[in-house]
Interface confidence: low
């Protein structure tokens, strides 16, 4: 009933709660002397379903058979309509349409840790649309049964708040869940288990690692576990890897030796536990332990290259360069590099430790045979030294690689190709391709890059430290014993027309011709490798086409003579620069009048 129903009653048969698809009979009847005031046969009883009229009848009572009610709650209200007055509410009723509960499925119980409590979950099946109460029962030894009720709307989990203990680990317990509502009840299939079946250990904790004598080969992992744990599984991986190494251990008692760890590597370790070989479930993985393994002495050898530069008749500058060892070769933090320079005939040797750099420059006499050895040292020792005899890398013309070319290969790559030298190609032991940014004046501080190529290769793709719109000086060396030959070329990965033309800084007169001098275009404005300069000139006030002179680009050149100017005529001169992509805009304009005598 939804109000006091003073004027009449609404009755529902067979029940206010019905099965989906059932029919109900609803009766609305007026109490004595509650009809219309003047003439009771004018009573008009109207039945509403929510706000919609579904039936009416003149008299003291109304009967209505209702079918097809939807799942959920439907409100029926009976009203009285008298002539010349508003409808008066008599009474009402709610009808609840639902279904009997389905059998709960997949009942499973778990106890998290030896000190945890038993909790069970199940699948309810389809919604009953009615108030449904779930009762969970657990029957165990000594004829004891625990039971707990759940009155949530959607109940599919209950924690008993009881703790199963391992006194009799083989004792059976049986769980069952029963769902009850007004239309029926249904019970799950019973689930029978022992302590060992349902206890899921807590993950191990307090994980530590120890390295005996600071050695990666003598490593022990320690952890703490719950008392009944029989099995453990360990997983570990380098922190930068996605793949785990797995180890299963029995009766480990909280320790295990690991034999295959790499030195100077940060690892992540996790452990899981289980109480029984084939019963129960594995714990969650423990929290990760992250630890770095100790260093070991470096393996591998440094890749060393060098440059020679003539200083004067008696001295030469040697610049040594080397590449960092890979992480797996360094096996620790490289503290310094040891460079030894030795004159082979006289036996004089000089050793120096280099920190923070992968290059070293020194000045040595041009006479004598010199060799260098370079090794890398960490806290545990040094790598094997790389030994190189210093020679004139380009001395043997017959060893010079032929037809060297450099072509752009996609973004920031240059493909260098060559033909073997004319001298017996089988004599070549290896090729070295070297590249550095082209800087006018041959700045020795510009970083040097190189790669080694097998003697049967005739191409190399260079991509390291290659930037767009920068010109690189590329050399290909062919090495054979103590001899070397080289060829060079300029190349870029991407080019466009230079952003500016050369700046003419001086024009001087020499014996009836002029010498034009200019400043190089800044490297960042060259936009690739320059191929030519052009010098333009025309008479000052003339509209005629300018004349021009095209000069092949050479790194060191910054002046050029012109001898086709007429004396005592004022000319305007300017310059441009060209790459393979096109011509720059004009540089500055200069006026000049040749003073020499006319022919």
């Amino acid at each position: 009933k939804i109000d006091a129903c003073k004027r009449g009653d609404v009755t529902v048969k067979p029940s206010h709660v019905i099965l989906l698809g059932s029919t109900v009979n609803i009766t609305c009847s007026l109490k004595p002397r509650q009809g219309c005031f003047h003439y009771s046969r004018r009573n008009k009883l109207i039945l509403y379903k929510f706000d919609r009229r579904i039936n009416f009848h003149h008299g003291h009572s109304l009967n209505s058979q209702v079918t097809g009610l939807p799942l959920g709650t439907t409100l029926f209200v009976c009203k009285l309509a008298c002539i010349n007055s508003d409808e008066i509410q008599i009474c009402g009723a709610e009808i609840f349409v639902g279904v009997a509960p389905e059998q709960p499925q997949n009942l499973s119980c778990i106890q998290k840790g030896e000190q945890g409590t038993v909790a069970c979950t199940w699948e309810r099946g389809r919604d009953t649309h009615l108030y449904t109460e779930y009762t969970l029962q657990l029957s165990g030894p000594k004829n004891l049964t625990w039971q707990k009720q759940c009155k949530d709307i959607y109940c599919d989990y209950l924690d008993f708040g009881i703790n199963l203990t391992p006194e009799s680990p083989e004792s059976n317990f049986t769980a069952k869940v029963t769902a009850v509502n007004s239309l029926g009840s249904s019970s799950s299939l019973p689930s029978t288990f022992t302590f060992l079946d349902i206890v899921r250990p807590l993950p191990p904790w307090d994980i530590r690692i120890k390295f005996q004598k600071a050695s990666v080969s003598r490593c022990t992992l320690y952890w703490r576990d719950e008392g009944l744990v029989l099995l453990n599984r360990l997983r570990y991986r380098p922190s930068n890897s996605r793949l785990w190494n797995m180890v299963n251990v029995t009766k480990a008692k909280g320790r295990h030796d690991l034999l295959d760890l790499k030195p100077f590597t940060e690892y992540e370790f996790q452990i899981s536990s289980k109480l029984h070989l084939y019963k129960g479930s594995w714990s969650d993985w423990s929290e990760s332990l992250r630890a770095q393994t100790p260093e070991e002495e470096p393996t591998g050898m440094l890749d060393v290259w060098y440059m020679k530069r003539h200083i004067d008749y008696s001295r030469q500058q040697i610049s040594l360069f080397w590449k960092n060892l890979s992480v797996s070769e360094a096996r620790g933090k490289i503290l310094h590099y040891q460079v030894t320079l030795q004159e082979l005939t006289g036996g004089k040797a000089m050793t120096q430790n280099i920190t923070g750099h992968t290059s070293w420059t020194t000045v040595i006499p041009r006479t004598g045979n010199w060799a260098v050895a370079v090794s890398a040292a960490n806290s545990k020792g040094s790598s094997l030294p790389t030994r190189i005899n210093i020679m004139n890398l380009c001395e043997a013309g017959l060893l010079a690689p032929r037809q060297v070319s450099a072509n752009s290969e996609g973004m920031d790559n240059i493909l260098v190709t060559w033909q073997p030298p004319r001298k017996d190609p089988s004599a070549v032991q290896e090729y070295v391709v070297e590249w550095r940014e082209l800087h006018p004046g041959g700045d020795t501080q510009v970083p040097l890059n190189w790669l080694r190529s097998r003697p049967y290769n005739v191409s190399a793709l260079i991509s390291e430290n290659i930037k767009s719109y920068i010109c690189y000086e590329i050399r290909v060396y062919a090495l054979s014993g103590d001899q070397g030959g080289c060829s060079s070329i300029l190349g870029n990965s991407k080019h466009k027309a230079p952003l500016s033309g050369p700046h003419i800084n001086a024009i001087t007169e020499e014996k009836g011709s002029i010498l034009i001098s200019w400043n190089s275009i800044p490297v960042q404005e060259q936009m690739g490798c320059l191929l030519h300069y052009r010098i333009y000139w025309k008479e000052r006030d003339s509209n005629s086409q300018p004349q021009l002179c095209e000069i092949p680009y050479r790194v060191s050149q910054n002046s050029h003579p012109i001898n086709s100017l007429q004396p005592r005529v004022t000319y305007v001169l300017w310059m441009t620069a060209l790459t393979a992509a096109g011509e720059s805009s004009h540089g500055n304009e200069r006026e000049f009048c040749l003073q020499g005598k006319a022919n």
């Epitope: 009155k151 949530d152 709307i153 959607y154 109940c155 599919d156 989990y157």
Partner: nanobody
Framework: QVQLQESGGGLVQAGGSLSLSCAAS????????MGWYRQAPGKQRELVAA???????IYHDSVKGRFTISRDNADSTVWLQMNSLKPDDTAVYYC?????????????????WGKGTQVTVSS
């Protein structure tokens, strides 16, 4: 102990809007879920919308697209913006909160409840 105080209920015409607000006080700093339930006369209490501290939102199908729940974790406050209201939305609206995260809690068994605020939508 956590106290929940609702405000913002009232009478509104169908198609109109209302905004409900609920502020938690007491030991509210560890509340995970905060949400709104409603109970119309003679009906079971039903979840309308809920939100957890990570910003996950849950809505009853009947209000999806019309109601928006939002939350200020720092102030332990939750709001329910109700647009395009219908007469079916008439009910007492309860604010509820819980430190746990289980679905059954969400569905009706939350630990903390407000006293409720009446929302009436007239046609």
């Amino acid at each position: 102990q956590v106290q929940l105080q609702e405000s913002g209920g009232g009478l509104v015409q169908a198609g109109g809007s209302l905004s409900l607000s609920c502020a938690a006080s007491g030991s509210a700093f560890r509340l995970n879920f905060m949400g709104w339930y409603r109970q119309a006369p003679g009906k079971q209490r039903e979840l309308v919308a809920a939100i957890n501290s990570g910003g996950t939102e849950i809505y009853h199908d009947s209000v999806k697209g019309r109601f928006t729940i939002s939350r200020d974790n720092a102030d332990s406050t939750v709001w329910l913006q109700m647009n395009s209201l219908k007469p079916d939305d008439t009910a007492v609206y309860y604010c509820a909160a819980d430190r746990g995260i289980s679905w059954s809690k969400l569905a009706g068994g939350m630990d903390y409840w407000g006293k409720g605020t009446q929302v009436t939508v007239s046609s």
